[in-house]
């Protein structure tokens, strides 16, 4: 039975040209995290594997940095980076947990962080 929950940074906004940290946290489970995938729509951004370490997709290697922790840092943001991002936690023995973050990249300097929320 999957008892865990994923807490994410929820809906967030950032300025064009700036950076943002995408962060998810798995709680309420003793399952072992074996891998975390970060994806944007159907595109793989990065993977953090407990044994193999970090892998950054070739398409994003110049703009994505691993961390902090199991999170992901997006740099040199463009308006095209606006959209949904998913953290996919592969765990044993529970299975897979998925969290969703919506990022809006703004032209102006009025970017504010949205509220945190949970996905069961």
């Amino acid at each position: 039975m999957m008892t865990g929950t994923i807490e994410t940074t929820g809906n967030i906004s950032a300025e064009k040209g700036g950076s943002i940290i995408l962060q998810c946290h798995l709680s309420s489970t003793t399952a072992q995290v074996t891998q975390v995938n970060w994806e944007q729509q159907d595109q793989l951004l990065a993977i953090c594997n407990a044994d193999l370490g970090w892998h950054i997709s070739p398409s994003f290697k110049d703009r994505v940095a691993p961390g902090p922790g199991l999170g992901l840092t997006l740099q040199s943001l463009t308006v095209n980076d606006t959209g949904e991002y998913f953290c996919i936690y592969h765990t044993y023995p529970d299975g897979t947990y998925t969290g969703r973050i919506f990022l809006e990249v703004l032209e102006s300097s009025v970017a504010e962080h949205g509220a945190r929320f949970q996905i069961p």
């Epitope: 891998q35 793989l44 407990a50 370490g53 892998h55």
Partner: antibody, heavy 118, light 107 residues
Framework: QVQLQESGPGLVKPSGTLSLTCAVS?????????WSWVRQPPGKGLEWIGE???????NYNPSLKSRVTISVGKSRNHISLKLSSVTAADTAVYYC???????????WGQGTLVTVSS | SYELTQDPAVSVALGQTVRITCQGD??????ASWYQQKPGQAPLLVLY???DRPSGIPDRFSGSRSGTTASLTITGAQAEDEADYYC??????????FGGGTKLTVL
């Protein structure tokens, strides 16, 4: 210099279990590497069998997963491969390999030919 | 599951340039590594990432990638480059895979 040396029976009977070991020198098995087995049937291409990490966790080729076990030997300086229920299709040169991170395979053993035949 | 596809055979005139390609959906998100194998020998790593060469590998070996295709280019092919070449990558589960191999003949 990392050196990998495979050893084991060169002939295994059909339905039996293929058992190979790989002696590792020049690097510690605990040193953040992974250790994998790759095979090559005569005249054919390379096939990844699976690997073991320093944590003891394993990752296997889905097509072989039900028959494969990779482990670290008690002396901790060798890696073992067991492949059960073998058939003639398992006849191949078996290579012990190592690397670190997501890629690539940095070092290969010289390989050992295993023939499955009665 | 993912697959990596290579042309079975390619030939090149001595001193000319040849490109060996590897195609697969997994290469959209992962790098390829390239191995050279001569008859009776274990494979040898010649290129990894996009264009990283291990020490001792001549600079006539280079690489590139575009979308789902990775390429190994040999500029000024030598007789000793005649061999089988295999590409290799991982998928999003960490599983490793190999292409079917390309037999390079130097004429």
């Amino acid at each position: 210099q990392v050196q990998l040396q495979e050893s084991g029976p060169g002939l295994v009977k059909p339905s039996g279990t293929l058992s190979l070991t790989c002696a590792v020198s020049g690097v510690s098995i605990r040193q953040g590497h992974w250790w994998s087995w790759v095979r090559q049937p005569p005249g054919k291409g390379l096939e990844w069998i699976g690997e073991i990490y320093q944590t003891g966790r394993t990752n296997y080729n889905p097509s072989l997963k039900s028959r494969v076990t990779i482990s670290v030997g008690k002396s901790r300086n060798h890696i073992s491969l067991k492949l059960s229920s073998v058939t003639a299709a398992d006849t191949a040169v078996y290579y012990c390999t190592t690397g670190s991170g997501w890629y690539p395979i940095d070092y290969w053993g010289q390989g050992t030919l295993v023939t499955v035949s009665s | 599951s993912y697959e990596l596809t290579q042309d079975p055979a390619v030939s090149v005139a001595l001193g000319q340039t040849v490109r060996i390609t590897c195609q697969g959906d997994s290469l959209r998100g992962f790098y390829a590594s390239w191995y050279q194998q001569k008859p009776g020998q274990a494979p040898l790593l010649v290129l990894y990432g996009v264009k990283d060469r291990p020490s001792g590998i001549p600079d006539r070996f280079s690489g590139s990638r575009s979308g789902t295709t990775a390429s190994l280019t040999i500029t000024g092919a030598q007789a000793e480059d005649e061999a089988d070449y295999y590409c290799n990558s991982r998928d999003s589960n960490g599983a490793m895979m190999f292409g079917g191999g390309t037999k390079l003949t130097v004429l």
